[in-house]
């Protein structure tokens, strides 16, 4: 029985050219996290592994930075970055927990109206 829950930053918006932090948090379980994967639709962005640390996919190396914590920082945002992002927690013994974040990248003037969704 999986008792844990994933809390995420939910639906967020950010300005084109800016940066955003994607963050998830696993709670309500004593399970041990062995690896966290960050994915955009079906593309792997990054892995944080208990043994090996961080690995950023080569195609995202210029625009993705690890952290803070198990989160992921996306930089130099473009409108094409709009979409769903998933944090996938591999745990022992529970198995896999998945959290979803929807990011909307907006033109500068529009993003100001959505600022309340941004992470400080």
């Amino acid at each position: 029985m999986m008792t844990g829950t994933i809390e995420t930053t939910g639906n967020i918006s950010a300005e084109k050219g800016g940066s955003i932090i994607l963050q998830c948090h696993l709670s309500s379980t004593t399970a041990q996290v062995t690896q966290v994967n960050w994915e955009q639709q079906d593309q792997l962005l990054a892995i944080c592994n208990a043994d090996l640390g961080w690995h950023i996919s080569p195609s995202f190396k210029d625009r993705v930075a690890p952290g803070p914590g198990l989160g992921l920082t996306l930089q130099s945002l473009t409108v094409n970055d709009t979409g769903e992002y998933f944090c996938i927690y591999h745990t022992y013994p529970d198995g896999t927990y998945t959290g979803r974040i929807f990011l909307e990248v907006l033109e500068s003037s529009v993003a100001e109206h959505g600022a309340r969704f941004q992470i400080p």
Partner: antibody
């Protein structure tokens, strides 16, 4: 060959302090979650504390009877885990075991041979 | 905290006999978090069964584990001399993690 070696036990007066150390070899220490477990004739096996891996934010958790008195820490560069024990009581006496657990598709669980702590005046 | 009660506290079995050790929890334990350890005098505990029913490396197939919720058991299908030891159940489903008081299994 997997090895966990505890040290630092001995005789200490009530109210005193002691630091236990455990050095690990033969497995990927940074990926292992580490515990201290103690054993005494009076209380049997008793979980003392754990420290998780970096991916678990090196989170620490403690047994009720040692909370606020004991501190667990780790140094991945030295493959070592420590237990700082303050304000020791007679009931803290026992054999202290270091335990390492690891999951990389299979689950592994390793224990040291233990170090004995005696709290007595 | 979850209290684990093991029974019997001491038991003896003849060679070839079927042995059943039980572990009763004061509240529900998730099965993936229920372990059994074997300990022989002068040695540290050894992982014997994890996740309720998975045998640790090197554990003979005559051992098995089962259970769910608040009731768990370790079974030896046919007792052998090397099985004489103490067996402890352990849960890490909730804090603080706890161990049972153990069952000392002796050879008749």
């Amino acid at each position: 060959e997997v090895k966990l070696e505890e040290s630092g036990g001995g005789l200490v007066q009530p109210g005193g302090s002691m630091k236990l150390s455990c050095v690990a070899s033969g497995f990927t220490f940074s990926g292992a979650w580490m515990d201290w477990v103690r054993q005494s004739p009076e209380k049997g096996l008793e979980w003392v504390a754990e420290i998780r891996t970096k991916v678990n934010n090196h989170a620490t958790n403690y047994g009720e009877s040692v909370k606020g008195r004991f501190t667990i820490s780790r140094d991945d560069s030295k493959s070592s885990v420590y237990l700082q024990m303050n304000n020791l009581r007679a009931e803290d006496s026992g054999i202290y075991y270091c335990r390492g657990a690891l999951y990389d598709g299979f689950y592994f669980d390793y224990w040291g041979q233990g170090t004995t702590l005696t709290v007595s005046s | 905290q979850i209290v684990l009660t093991q029974s019997p506290a001491i038991m003896s079995a003849s060679p070839g006999e079927k042995v059943n050790l039980t572990c009763s929890a004061s509240s529900s334990v998730s099965s993936g978090y229920l372990y059994w350890y074997q300990q022989k005098p002068g040695s540290s505990p050894k992982l014997w069964i994890y996740g309720t029913s998975t045998l640790a490396s090197g554990v003979p197939a005559r051992f098995s584990g089962s259970g769910s919720g608040t009731s768990y058991s370790l079974t030896i299908s046919n007792m052998e001399a090397e099985d004489a030891a103490s067996y402890f159940c352990h849960q890490w489903s909730s804090f603080p993690y706890t161990f049972g008081g153990g069952t000392k299994l002796e050879m008749k």
